[in-house]
């Protein structure tokens, strides 16, 4: 019969700077029922608030919907674990939504072999930014990365595409089936997961010669 162990807020992520979610790891439970609560205040304010939504992000999480999310404001948060023996607090975590964005993967990945008559053949890759990201406002600059490999190969070949949403690759092995994926990252923030793989069969007559 002990108080709960110290919890730890280990991750906060936002898909688009409009909402965000934080997750914590419970400490030891002390062998008793344990309640967790996340409290926060915004930098420069003293008023403490409790997590508005413990459900959306799954177990041991707090989700901040649009009405609770402000850009350019630092959130200072901590988790309190309580049982009948007492309470333990996580360390405070400072969160700026600008720096925790992890977008969804890019969408509509399309891959095509192009074989112009007068030029070298190439692999043409095209995609769309994730739906939740509004690039028109200028709030976001998304950077893209492509990876591809022959189906049975162990190593991925990685290409940085910058801000463009299409890319050409010239050097491929004829007759091989390739897997292609793309991911994106805001200027400040985290890489998205890789998009689902798209497969493309490279024709046997695909030539790499000049």
């Amino acid at each position: 019969q002990l108080p709960p162990g110290k919890p730890e807020i280990f991750k906060c992520r936002s898909p688009n700077k409009e909402t965000f979610t934080c997750w914590w790891r419970p400490g030891t439970d002390g062998g008793l029922p344990t309640n967790y609560s996340l409290t926060y205040h915004r930098e420069g304010e003293t008023l403490m608030h409790e997590c508005p939504d413990y459900i959306t992000g799954g177990p041991n999480s707090c989700h901040f919907g649009k009405q609770y999310t402000s850009m350019w404001r630092t959130y200072i948060m901590m988790v309190n674990a309580t049982n009948q023996m007492g309470s333990s607090f996580s360390d405070e975590l400072y969160v700026d939504v600008t720096y925790i964005v992890q977008p969804d993967p890019p969408l509509e990945l399309a891959v095509e072999v192009k074989q112009p008559e007068d030029r070298k053949p190439y692999l043409w890759i095209k995609w769309s930014p994730p739906t939740l990201i509004d690039l028109k406002t200028g709030w976001f600059t998304l950077l893209y990365e492509i990876r591809l490999k022959p189906e049975k190969a162990a190593e991925w070949e990685i290409h940085f595409a910058g801000q463009q949403t299409e890319f050409k690759i010239l050097s491929l092995h004829p007759g091989q089936k390739y897997l292609v994926q793309v991911r994106c990252k805001p200027d400040h923030g985290y890489w998205s997961a890789w998009s689902p793989a798209t497969f493309i069969q490279i024709p046997s007559d695909f030539t790499m010669n000049d």
Partner: antibody, heavy 117, light 107 residues
């Protein structure tokens, strides 16, 4: 009201075992557990270990690890402490205690275990 | 294991006196400290938990203080029923440990 009622005094021979019970009432037994503390004659309090009625977890003081078993029975809201291989050094009053709202807020009346040949 | 050292081990005082018993932990116990009163032939009674919080039904003449490793129990105006043995206990980590006790006697 909350009550912890312990079984009666026991006299045991060295090498024997003893099983002390602690019947709980007046609170939700399954959200807590039973802790055991002993007190040798004229000595201080010594924590022995505990058994959780919430998740079945047990923790024992190293000194007792090999010869004590603590259990809780949620159907009868009773905690048990069994000690084996008794010696005269185990002569003591054995208390059960629990956590209802605050740490160790309720105690049993104590059970005197005398180990004598 | 966390050692709990109480002082003094015994104390003589008169009715109406204010007395303080101290307890030192061998390492930081995050204020997970309790104080118990025990009278001869009786079970311990919890007075204070979390270093300074009064258990329900305990008179306010008992107060606890301190933090980190150094703690104290103060009885503001001794009454005859307060003469007993007092124990501190840490419940920050296993094994839970008690101080050796302070016997409070009538002078």
């Amino acid at each position: 009201q909350v009550q912890l009622v312990q079984s009666g005094a026991e006299v045991k021979k060295p090498g024997a075992s003893v099983k002390v019970s602690c019947k709980a009432s007046g609170y939700t037994f399954g959200t807590s557990g039973i802790t055991w503390v002993r007190q040798a004659p004229g000595q201080g309090l010594e924590w022995m270990g505990w058994s959780s009625a919430y998740n079945g977890k047990t923790d024992y003081a190293q000194k007792f690890q090999d010869r004590v078993t603590m259990t809780t029975d949620t159907s009868t809201t009773t905690g048990y402490m069994e000690m084996r291989s008794l010696t005269s050094d185990d002569t003591a009053v054995y208390y059960c205690t629990t956590v209802v709202r605050r740490p160790f807020d309720f105690w049993g009346q104590g059970t005197l275990v005398t180990v004598s040949s | 294991d966390i050692q709990m050292t109480q002082s003094p081990s015994s104390l003589s005082a008169s009715v109406g006196d204010r007395v303080t018993i101290t307890c030192r932990a061998s390492q930081d116990i995050n204020n997970f400290l309790a104080w118990f009163q025990q009278k001869p032939g009786k079970a311990p009674k919890s007075l204070i938990y979390a270093a300074s919080s009064l258990q329900s039904g305990v008179p306010s003449k008992f107060s606890g203080g301190g933090s980190g490793t150094d703690f104290a129990l103060t009885i503001s105006s001794l009454q005859p029923e307060d003469f007993a043995t007092y124990y501190c206990q840490q419940y920050s980590s296993y094994p839970i440990t008690f101080g050796q006790g302070t016997r409070l006697e009538i002078k």
